[in-house]
Amino acid sequence: ITQQDLAPQQRAAPQQKRSSPSEGLCPPGHHISEDGRDCISCKYGQDYSTHWNDLLFCLRCTRCDSGEVELSPCTTTRNTVCQCEEGTFREEDSPEMCRKCRTGCPRGMVKVGDCTPWSDIECVHKESGTKHSGEVPAVEETVTSSPGTPASPCS
């Protein structure tokens, strides 16, 4: 089993504040009560859970930092999605901060890739076509457009 098999739902179906756990687990958008008898809804915009769980608390929503824009808000089943502002990118080696993209390529190099929220501009040597050694490779986008539906605890 991998987490890949256990995708969160895009939008929670309307549910009551409390419901019963299934095999000791609560669905996305909920956490389990301390006595283990109830599933309690997360608070919209405050906390969330993306998977079936037995958490005693939902997870706190991320707040986008200055220098980031909010792509999608926190729901009860999905954390906030933040993205670096235009002209900046998040480096894989230091994902906590957005860094300014370079404005141009060094002499003798030509730009072959634009600044994106996930990568700096990409420069290659004019003759050889090899990447500049200081180049940060593009990071695969982790935001997914169609996450599918959650696995039930007995799947």
Epitope: I1, T50, L55, R78, T142
Partner: antibody
Framework: EVQLVESGGGLVQPGGSLRLSCAAS????????MSWVRQAPGKGLEWVAA????????HYPDTVKGRFTISRDNAKNSLYLQMNSLRAEDTAVYYC??????????????WGQGTLVTVSS | NIVLTQSPDSLAVSLGERATINCRAS??????????MHWYQQKPGQPPKLLIY???NLESGVPDRFSGSGSRTDFTLTISSLQAEDVAVYYC?????????FGGGTKVEIK
């Protein structure tokens, strides 16, 4: 306060068997995943087995699959690990843990003090 | 199996100074905005204790000088101001897939 107390460890010969027990208190035992984690002397941690709240879903790593059996008795708030065909490399402190579930068995929220199993002739 | 490699193996830091421990996974442990990486502290003669779950969530009762960060394959546990009681071995653990695996541990000592 959550308390997990292991028992049943001891010295056993290679090829032998041993049954470990864990008595749980301070938590609704029948609501939670439980697990065993071991630590060989002076070494790191290794997950050994996990079981869901009603015993219907069980997980093992390949290193112990077919030799170890995890089980639980919710009426007694107890977790068990039956270990057969023991080898020298199974020598370790065995910890009973409350395993948080988040999409998968996830992180070990509470730990017992451990019980030492020594496999030697 | 996902292999977790911790660095350094041991670390000596002065009291009040920052300690940084790294954990690298052999493949990404991220999905849907969650990083399935967790951190534990084990003091001599004691069982491990959960510090951080899902990369950056501080377990209840853990001092806020401990923090976790990182995503995909690279994760960091930081002790912002080392205290004498922080002398221990620290382990990372992933739950992206079965089997659950731990890093080899990093021993933190006082310089």
């Amino acid at each position: 306060e959550v308390q997990l107390v292991e028992s049943g460890g001891g010295l056993v010969q290679p090829g032998g068997s041993l049954r470990l027990s864990c008595a749980a208190s301070g938590l609704p035992f029948n609501s939670y995943y439980m697990s065993w984690v071991r630590q060989a002397p002076g070494k790191g941690l290794e997950w050994v087995a996990a079981i869901n709240s009603n015993g219907g879903r069980i997980h093992y790593p390949d290193t112990v699959k077919g030799r170890f059996t995890i089980s639980r008795d919710n009426a007694k708030n107890s977790l068990y690990l039956q270990m057969n065909s023991l080898r020298a490399e199974d020598t370790a402190v065995y910890y009973c843990t409350r395993l948080t579930y988040y999409g998968n068995p996830a992180w070990f929220a509470y730990w017992g003090q451990g019980t030492l199993v020594t496999v030697s002739s | 199996n996902i292999v977790l490699t911790q660095s350094p193996d041991s670390l000596a830091v002065s009291l009040g100074e920052r300690a940084t421990i790294n954990c690298r996974a052999s493949e990404s442990v991220d999905i849907y905005g969650n990083s399935f990486m967790h951190w534990y502290q084990q003091k001599p003669g004691q069982p491990p204790k959960l510090l951080i779950y899902l990369s950056s969530n501080l377990e209840s009762g853990v001092p806020d000088r401990f923090s976790g960060s990182g995503s995909r394959t690279d994760f960091t546990l930081t002790i912002s101001s080392l205290q004498a009681e922080d002398v221990a071995v620290y382990y990372c653990q992933q739950s992206y897939e079965d089997p659950l695996t731990f890093g080899g541990g990093t021993k933190v000592e006082i310089k």
